[in-house]
């Protein structure tokens, strides 16, 4: 990129540069015509018969350098061939010399600085590549010369450029003074500012474009070369912030459109919102969940939104005394999650009708909550109680939902408590064909004992056909028709309104061998 300090082609008024000495044959400001057929201000000198050593000087106005360390001067000029000039003397030249003088202000006058090399600094002696020549009987032909010179290094606020003619017939058609700078550049989402090179190469720190953040690693930098070109160098660069994606050839970050999101900084483009979510604004890093849908704390920001599951289905109960086996089917709707668990809530109602949450005497196997399988065994149920179990399905977002958790209920009423087993049977009387038995009345928790059932069989006769039963309303019984001198195993159970209790332990009794022994009272 070139920044112009002076371009005479663009000047419309007289340039009014300073010449020295004030004599005839000096540089003269004239109108000229350039390639585009525009009128331009030019300087011409044509004193080809001067005395040797005599010089004509032309000096520009003061040019502020605007921070440039090296300035370039492009000269466009024409020059007549000495051979075409019949009256040209030996002093006719086809070259001229360019100088510059630095100063911190426009302080030069018609006489100062002294018109000589040192204080003026010589840039170059310029020779014409193309000479305008004229041969008798032919039109003059020639071409414009273009020469670019480099001035510097410059350190003061500004400078003058000067031209010294020592016998040429030439015209300075235009002067373009400029410096080179590296143009503002955006690459890899990193903006490098316009930079005037102060040295051969200058490191330039970059900054992230709007809505971009630095990538990990060293901060991005590029090198600005003296010729105004950025040195080709990989740039660590920046990346678009969450909610933004790279656009326009990696030169800017564009906000994610409505309905899309980008959760992290870095490469990658905006993605459509995941299931059950939306973004109503541009530049979303995360999509908001629809009403009733949630993300768990541990869910990635880009995960779909999920909802709590529906209730479990088809709870089946199997009561076995004080134990209950519950089993159910998975809910119809999992809510879109895999982390499904089950939990139970329990209420118990006494026979009198008062209800409360279940007490601590119940045990749940494997537990009352965080069940991963659809079953549980509940132990320690009390008799004649009604239990209500609510089976709920839960997942990772259940805790985020408001409102009641759906459940599937099941009611189970336990049997009233049966009398305990009858033990301590004693034989009160024994004969060869009968046994009289008595026992203590068991303490029945749910009402009085209504009757008893006696179960007996001969020892060694184990088949079902050998077992005999006897009912009695008293806590005694007489077993008749028994074998003489035989051993019998006897069990008794009591019945209340709740039903039969369990049989007690087997009691071993024996009939008499003969009648003569008579009745013998057997005391336990």
């Amino acid at each position: 990129l070139e920044e112009t300090l002076l371009n005479t082609k663009l000047e419309t008024a007289d340039l009014k540069w300073v010449t020295f000495p004030q004599v005839d044959g000096q540089w003269e400001e004239l109108s000229g015509l350039d390639e585009e057929q525009h009128s331009v201000r030019t300087y011409e000198v044509c004193d080809v018969q001067r005395a040797p050593g005599q010089a004509h000087w032309l000096r520009t106005g003061w040019v502020p350098r605007r921070g440039a360390v090296h300035v370039y001067a492009t000269l466009r000029f024409t020059m007549l061939e000495c051979l075409s000039l019949p009256r040209a003397g030996r002093s006719c030249k086809e070259t001229f010399t360019v100088f510059y003088y630095e100063s911190d202000a426009d302080t030069a006058t018609a006489l100062t600085p002294a018109w000589m090399e040192n204080p003026y600094i010589k840039v170059d002696t310029v020779a014409a590549e193309h000479l305008t020549r004229k041969r008798p009987g032919a039109e003059a032909t020639g071409k414009v010369n273009v020469k670019t010179l480099r001035l510097g290094p410059l350190s003061k606020a500004g400078f003058y450029l000067a031209f010294q003619d020592q016998g040429a017939c030439m015209a300075l058609l235009s002067l373009h003074l400029f410096y080179k700078k590296c143009a503002q550049l955006t690459v890899n989402l990193t903006r490098f500012p316009e930079t005037v090179p102060r040295e051969l190469v200058v490191p330039v720190a970059g900054s992230c474009v709007v809505d971009a953040v630095p990538a990990p690693g060293p901060s991005p930098s590029l090198y600005c070369r003296e010729d105004g070109q950025w040195a080709e160098q990989p740039v660590t660069g920046c990346s678009c912030a969450p909610g933004f994606e790279a656009a326009e050839g990696n030169t800017k970050c564009r906000a994610c459109a409505q309905g899309t999101f980008k959760p992290l900084s870095g490469e990658g483009s905006c993605q459509p919102c995941p299931a059950n979510s939306h973004s109503n604004t541009i530049g979303s890093a995360v999509c908001q969940c629809r009403v009733g849908y949630f993300r768990a704390r541990t869910d990635p920001r880009g995960a779909p939104c999920t909802t709590p599951p529906s209730a479990p289905r088809s709870v089946v109960s199997r009561l076995n005394g004080s134990s209950l086996h519950l089993e159910w089917s998975a809910p119809l709707e999992s809510g879109g999650r895999e982390d499904l668990t089950y939990a139970l809530r329990c209420r118990e109602c006494r026979p009198g009708g008062s209800c409360a949450p279940c007490g601590g005497d119940l045990t749940f196997d494997p537990g009352p909550r965080d069940l991963v399988e659809p079953w549980v065994v509940v132990r320690g149920l009390r008799p004649d109680f009604t239990y209500t179990f609510e089976v709920t399905a839960l997942n990772g977002v259940s805790s985020l939902a408001t409102g009641p958790v759906p459940f599937e209920p099941v009611n189970v009423t336990t049997d009233r408590e049966v009398p305990p087993a009858v033990s301590d049977i004693r034989v009160t009387r024994s004969s060869p064909s009968s046994l009289s038995l008595a026992w203590a009345v068991p303490r029945a928790p749910s009402g009085a004992v209504l009757d008893y059932e006696v179960k007996y069989h001969e020892k060694g006769a184990e088949g079902p056909s050998s077992v005999r039963f006897l009912k009695t309303s008293e806590n005694r019984a007489e077993l008749r028709g028994l074998k003489r001198g035989a051993s019998y195993l006897v069990q008794v159970r009591a019945r209340s309104e709740a039903g039969y209790g369990p049989f007690g332990q087997e009691h071993h009794s024996q009939t008499q061998l003969d009648e003569s022994e008579g009745w013998r009272e057997q005391l336990a």
Epitope: Q37, T78, L85
Partner: antibody
Framework: QVQLVQSGAEVKKPGSSVKVSCKAS????????ISWVRQAPGQGLEWMGK????????DYAQKFQGRVTITADESTSTAYMELSSLRSEDTAVYYC???????????????????WGQGTLVTVSS | DIQMTQSPSSLSASVGDRVTITCRAS??????LNWYQQKPGKAPKLLIY???ILQSGVPSRFSGSGSGTDFTLTISSLQPEDFATYYC??????????FGQGTKVEIK
């Protein structure tokens, strides 16, 4: 502004010669083209030839070749046109005209003439 | 020499009219063509050079166009001071500077 001042009117006999001068005042002279143009009474313009003083030699229209001589004196910034073997049809106003640009300051060698002398009437009569 | 032919040789027009004068060269002269205006008893005045470049100080109602062999001078809206004779002049690298025979613009 450059001025071109021509010499006064001349009355000449057929067969004689006439030399008309054209003095340029102010600034560069050597590298401009000085053309000579004549205009017979009631007629159009007729280009006779031109000179670029720094080069010395002149270029002439075919019609006047051998009868006209154009010269220039750089020291006095004066151009001259001499026409010999005068005939009555040479009776005309003779103009000198300077080109718009010097030979060095125009990209194209336009020979456009933007500065004209006041004209010199040359009458050829026996 | 190259011949230059102007047409018409004269024309009558009123103030405000658009006037067009043409000039034809006998061979290609690129755009090396000039137009001059001359009033009686005065030296010619350069209007246009290089076929289309307006000379400094010349009103913008004057314009020129063309290249090669056919050229045109146009006065977009004729003014009282424009009544004069107009000449085209070719200039080539082969030394000549031939004029056309002129076009006289008169008041209608």
């Amino acid at each position: 502004q450059v001025q071109l001042v021509q010499s006064g009117a001349e009355v000449k006999k057929p067969g004689s010669s006439v030399k008309v001068s054209c003095k340029a005042s102010g600034g560069t002279f050597s590298t401009y083209a000085i053309s000579w143009v004549r205009q017979a009474p009631g007629q159009g313009l007729e280009w006779m030839g031109k000179i670029i003083p720094i080069f010395g030699d002149a270029d002439y229209a075919q019609k006047f070749q051998g009868r006209v001589t154009i010269t220039a004196d750089e020291s006095t910034s004066t151009a001259y046109m001499e026409l010999s073997s005068l005939r009555s049809e040479d009776t005309a106003v003779y103009y000198c005209a300077r080109s718009s640009y010097t030979i060095l300051t125009t990209y194209y060698n336009y020979n456009a003439m933007d500065n004209w002398g006041q004209g010199t009437l040359v009458t050829v009569s026996s | 020499d190259i011949q230059m032919t102007q047409s018409p040789s004269s024309l009558s027009a009123s103030v405000g009219d658009r006037v067009t004068i043409t000039c034809r060269a006998s061979q290609n002269i690129n755009n090396f063509l000039n137009w001059y205006q001359q009033k009686p008893g005065k030296a010619p005045k350069l209007l246009i050079y290089g076929s289309s470049i307006l000379q400094s100080g010349v009103p913008s109602r004057f314009s020129g166009s063309g290249s090669g062999t056919d050229f045109t001078l146009t006065i977009s809206s004729l003014q009282p001071e424009d009544f004069a004779t107009y000449y085209c002049q070719q200039y080539d690298f082969y030394l000549s500077g031939t004029f056309g025979q002129g076009t006289k613009v008169e008041i209608k």
